[in-house]
């Protein structure tokens, strides 16, 4: 039997059953999430669930830029340090950098400080690049 690899939307890349779209547009976290949803296919800001997934994404993004942080789908909606993925994925894999998570920083970004392999919390109103994800 021939198993066809699913195709992603133009400009998105495929990895292990998921499609990812990296957008070098400036959005606050909630606008970024709504834009991801607008692309259909059940897309959301990306959940990152393993080191392998993180490494693949980081390698891809590093081909475009190495200095701008990028919103991902991890947030703290109750503002109680109870982090959850916006797409409903289980929050098991963690890759926080050592930076403080205090103040009003209730949305997560991939940090450029460690080649996008670690996360930092940031203020959700900040305008930043963002990463979307869906399962084709």
């Amino acid at each position: 039997d021939i198993i066809m690899r699913p195709s992603c939307a133009p400009g998105w890349f495929y990895h292990k059953s998921n499609c990812y779209g990296y957008f070098r547009k400036l959005r606050n976290w909630s606008d970024a999430e709504l834009e991801c949803q607008s692309y259909g296919n059940g897309a959301h800001l990306a959940s990152i669930l393993s080191l392998k997934e993180a490494s693949t994404i980081a390698e891809y993004i590093s081909g475009y830029q190495r200095s701008q942080p990028i919103w991902i789908g991890l947030h703290d909606p109750q503002k109680r340090q109870q982090w959850q993925w916006i797409d409903g994925a289980m929050y098991l894999y963690r890759s926080w950098s050592g930076k403080s998570m205090g103040g009003n920083k209730h949305c997560a970004e991939m940090s450029s400080n460690n080649n996008f392999l670690t996360w930092s919390s940031n203020e959700c109103n900040k305008r930043q690049h963002f990463l979307c994800k869906y399962r084709p």
């Epitope: 547009k25 103040g103 109103n125």
Partner: antibody, heavy 118, light 109 residues
């Protein structure tokens, strides 16, 4: 209830630097996690975004004004400042400050008229 | 100005008036559109956010919509207090900044 009040000289000479201050009450700049923007409106004309500064100090500017505009925050005095260098008569306008949530402006200050004339 | 609006619009009380806002894929098509009302001699006030949402206190006579690179604001049941300038606005991805429309003066006849 957040309120914004612009202040500064109403008259500036050509080639000089326009300096305005926006005092924020009802919110703490250091804890609010917002951008704070400046928008201007020449008499009888439309609105033009000058730029916005995040409370931490990083700023975005209108490309057409980027070389002349500088926006900064003073979290101790709860103020946002605008400096516009090398002004001409075309910079005569009502200058507004507004809170910017990364998506839109709300609320706005009442505005202050700055006239550039010798 | 990157966003284009008609300079004026007028209608009699109780009628409906629609204001258009034309842009591009860099702003309106892939960004949210916002509308501001500026009553004579006052600062602008947010009227519509995220294309079609009304802040609390804004009557449901005001409605926003968007299709492709154009947006529109409709005012139904027009009243004399609606006489004002109306501006559309959006983030522009090519400029990395906000852009405003040229503004439309609404007159209630």
């Amino acid at each position: 209830q957040v309120q914004l009040q612009e202040s500064g000289p109403g008259l500036v000479k050509p080639s000089e630097t326009l300096s305005l201050t926006c005092t924020v009450s009802g919110d703490s700049l250091s804890r609010s996690s917002y951008y704070w923007g400046w928008i201007r409106q020449p008499p009888g004309k439309g609105l033009e975004w000058i730029g916005s500064v995040f409370y931490s100090g990083s700023a975005d500017y209108n490309p057409s004004l980027k070389s002349r505009a500088s926006i900064s925050v003073d979290t101790y005095q709860n103020q946002v400042s605008l400096k516009l260098t090398s002004v001409t008569a075309a910079d005569t306008a009502v200058y507004y400050c507004a809170r910017d949530d990364g998506s839109t402006f709300d609320p706005w200050g009442r505005g202050t008229l700055v006239t550039v004339s010798s | 100005y990157v966003l284009t609006q008609p300079p004026s619009a007028s209608e009699t009380p109780g009628q409906r008036v629609t204001i258009s806002c034309s842009g591009s894929s860099a702003n309106i098509e892939y960004n949210f559109v916002y509308w501001y009302q500026q009553l004579p001699g006052t600062a602008p006030k947010l009227l519509i956010y995220r294309n079609n949402q009304r802040p609390s206190g804004v009557p449901d006579r005001f409605s926003g919509s968007k299709s492709g690179t154009s947006a529109s604001l409709a005012i139904s049941g027009l009243r004399s207090e609606d006489e004002a300038d109306y501006y559309c606005a959006a983030w522009d991805d090519s400029l990395n900044g906000y852009v405003f429309g040229t503004g439309t003066k609404v007159t209630v006849l």
